[in-house]
């Protein structure tokens, strides 16, 4: 149980293209065929103008035309929906496939990839039907770009919706040593963070988010996974104590703004018969800015490193109400391996703490849309898009 963390199954609310809570000013495009196929006509199920956004230039062979949606705040985007240009039966244009790029800061753009590294998403087969695509893994983004594709020179048009929820954790990135491979007699268990969207340098992953923040918790047997067609160890990121003579794995966490931290929850494996143990303890330090020193004595939380019940579980580490925008936590080994599947935080934004990232004046002027001001997880009166067998999701 990861009480306090978001439930990805419920993070599937329409984010405002169709119902227009995303204003026209937050939709932009690389180009438009005409004013009647401009950015503002890219809303799912909309029949305004000529019935969709259509780029001015061809999308084959170069895939450079895009439709950009600014969500104004960080969201977890779990699902996207696309349509072509129907226009009361007059439109024939649609995109059979597309790519997504996303950004949390407006500067660095990441390509969305599925769990096997594929970027291309199957799109529409006709101009009118809505095709929903479950994003596995989901993306934490403020800006999302759709890049329609074609396999020959042809016209493509697009209408879209995004589904997800507000990213309430406020976590911008975590830094951690690269996850390692466990050699068991019968199988290689790859305990790497396979969806990490930051940088990797030397032994370090930094500047991104990945499997430790995707809402998916691992099973009791770390060789198994809830995902289909993935390799053993997929749900976990793990480190061998033999790589860390210090006796701990060190991680850093960067948040969107100054926060008061109550609790950190770490979902850990405890299959001690194969060497995975809960941490023996956790130490965390805080700082308010990137160039500042870590403040005072770390918060220390001793754990049993329990050999007992081998089931995976979430451990809750009290953080004592300390204030910061950066955390550095050391997880102490109590056995041969540390295996984590999820790390989340319960925190409160410090009053009058404005977004510190990205800095002004990159963002367009104007107040944020009012529909997100309440910090609600789900928009009022909406039902999340169901994820069920037989549903029209890819």
């Amino acid at each position: 149980d990861m009480k306090g963390h978001f439930d990805p199954a419920k993070c599937r609310y329409a984010l405002g293209m169709q119902d227009r809570t995303i204003p026209d000013s937050d939709i932009s495009v690389s180009s438009s065929w005409s004013d009647s196929t401009a950015a503002r006509h890219s809303r799912l199920e909309s029949s305004d103008g000529d019935g969709a956004w259509c780029p001015a230039g061809p999308v084959f062979p170069k895939e450079e035309e895009y439709l950009q949606v600014d969500l104004r705040r960080l969201h977890l985007v779990a699902l996207v929906g696309t349509q072509g240009r129907h226009a009361g039966g007059l439109g024939k244009e649609f995109s059979r496939s597309y790519r997504l790029r996303y950004s949390r800061d407006g500067r660095r753009w990441m390509d969305w990839k599925d769990r096997w590294g594929q970027e291309v998403i199957s799109g529409n087969e006709d101009p009118g039907g809505v095709v929903l695509k479950d994003l596995g893994p989901p993306m934490v983004a403020r800006l999302v770009r759709f890049y329609p594709r074609a396999d020959r020179v042809m016209s493509v048009c697009l209408r879209v919706e995004l589904y997800g929820c507000l990213w309430r954790d406020g976590l911008l990135s975590y830094t951690a040593p690269v996850g390692q491979t466990m050699q068991l007699s019968e199988v290689m268990v790859h305990l790497n963070d396979s969806t990490y969207d930051g940088y990797t340098a030397g032994g370090l992953q930094y500047g991104g988010l990945g499997q430790l923040a995707d809402g998916v918790v691992g099973l009791d047997d770390f060789r198994q996974s809830q995902e289909l067609r993935v390799w053993p160890g997929y749900d976990y990121v793990g480190w061998s104590n033999q790589s860390f003579p210090t006796g701990y794995v060190e991680m850093e966490f960067e948040f969107d703004r100054l926060r008061t931290f109550q609790t950190m929850q770490v979902h850990c494996n405890n299959m001690h018969t194969l060497g995975a143990r809960l941490p023996g303890g956790v130490e965390c330090r805080f700082k308010r800015g990137p160039a500042m020193a870590w403040e005072g004595e770390p918060v220390r939380h001793a754990l049993g490193g329990s050999l007992g019940d081998p089931r995976a579980r979430a451990i809750s580490v009290p953080l004592g109400g300390h204030v910061g925008r950066f955390l550095q936590c050391r997880f102490l080994f109590a056995g041969p391996w540390l295996l984590f599947s999820e790390i989340s935080f319960i925190s409160d934004v410090v009053n009058d703490s404005s977004d510190t990232f990205p800095p002004a004046p990159w963002w367009p002027p104007g107040p944020p849309p009012t529909n997100f001001s309440s910090l609600e997880l789900e928009p009022r009166g909406q039902q999340p898009v169901a994820k069920a067998e037989g549903s029209p999701t890819a």
Epitope: Q180, T200, G202, G203, L204, Y206, W239, S240, P245
Partner: antibody, heavy 121, light 107 residues
Framework: QVQLVESGGRVVQPGRSLRLSCTAS????????MLWVRQAPGKGLEWIGT???????YYASWAKGRFTISRDNSKNTLYLQMNSLRAEDTAVYYC???????????????WGQGTLVTVSS | DIQMTQSPSSVSASVGDRVTITCQAS??????LAWYQQKPGKAPKLLIS???DLASGVPSRFSGSGSGTDFTLTISSLQPEDFATYYC?????????FGGGTKVEIK
């Protein structure tokens, strides 16, 4: 171009101090574990010490107290401060960058060309 | 501190021979082992990390195996450019000792 260039090696008298530099280009030093390794003439490789991306330092037991590793991020330069030098410290000194393979384990993928330190009266 | 012991210290072999070099750690180091090749007057070159992962550009005739305390580097068919000295290294996030080296010479 990604490279490491050591400098500062020279002939020095026993008991004196010397600081070696290792300047990185094409990448940021502070995103890697960086190591100093030496090799006496006709001998094998000998690990001296390591500095982590979090500025934690580790030393071989024989190097503790006499050798200090540091870095200046603004100059993208790694340093090895050597004090109370002895004849047996005569060696080629290398800096090296630790990278990870597909299995998440470290190896020294990038090395400098080495700089020769000769301790002699 | 962990010690790494390599054997043999030298080996004479001919082109086409299979050569095996062993490295023993004074205590278990799991998979935290790398192998290097060094030629006279040159810096070492990484061959293998994580016991068996070949570094970029390393020919497939090189292979690594082992776990715990005993490790092996194998050259399946020795080539002229393989005559060199080989080192193992325990390389964790911290102290990183090398083995004493094995010189592969022309018979």
């Amino acid at each position: 171009q990604v490279q490491l260039v050591e400098s500062g090696g020279r002939v020095v008298q026993p008991g004196r101090s010397l600081r070696l530099s290792c300047t990185a280009s094409g990448f940021s030093l502070n995103r890697y574990y960086m190591l100093w390794v030496r090799q006496a003439p006709g001998k094998g490789l000998e690990w001296i010490g390591t500095i982590s991306y979090g500025d934690t330092t580790y030393y071989a037991s024989w190097a503790k107290g006499r050798f200090t590793i540091s870095r200046d991020n603004s100059k993208n330069t790694l340093y090895l401060q050597m004090n109370s030098l002895r004849a047996e410290d005569t060696a080629v000194y290398y800096c090296a960058r630790a990278d990870t393979g597909d299995n998440g384990y470290l190896g020294l993928q990038l090395w400098g060309q080495g700089t020769l330190v000769t301790v002699s009266s | 501190d962990i010690q790494m012991t390599q054997s043999p210290s030298s080996v004479s072999a001919s082109v086409g021979d299979r050569v095996t070099i062993t490295c023993q750690a004074s205590q278990s180091i799991g998979s935290v082992l790398a192998w290097y090749q060094q030629k006279p007057g040159k810096a070492p070159k990484l061959l293998i990390s994580g016991v068996f992962d070949l570094a970029s550009g390393v020919p497939s005739r090189f292979s690594g195996s082992g776990s715990g305390t005993d490790f092996t580097l194998t050259i399946s068919s020795l080539q002229p450019e393989d005559f060199a000295t080989y080192y193992c290294q325990y390389i964790p996030y911290g102290s990183s000792p090398f083995g004493g080296g094995t010189k592969v010479e022309i018979k």
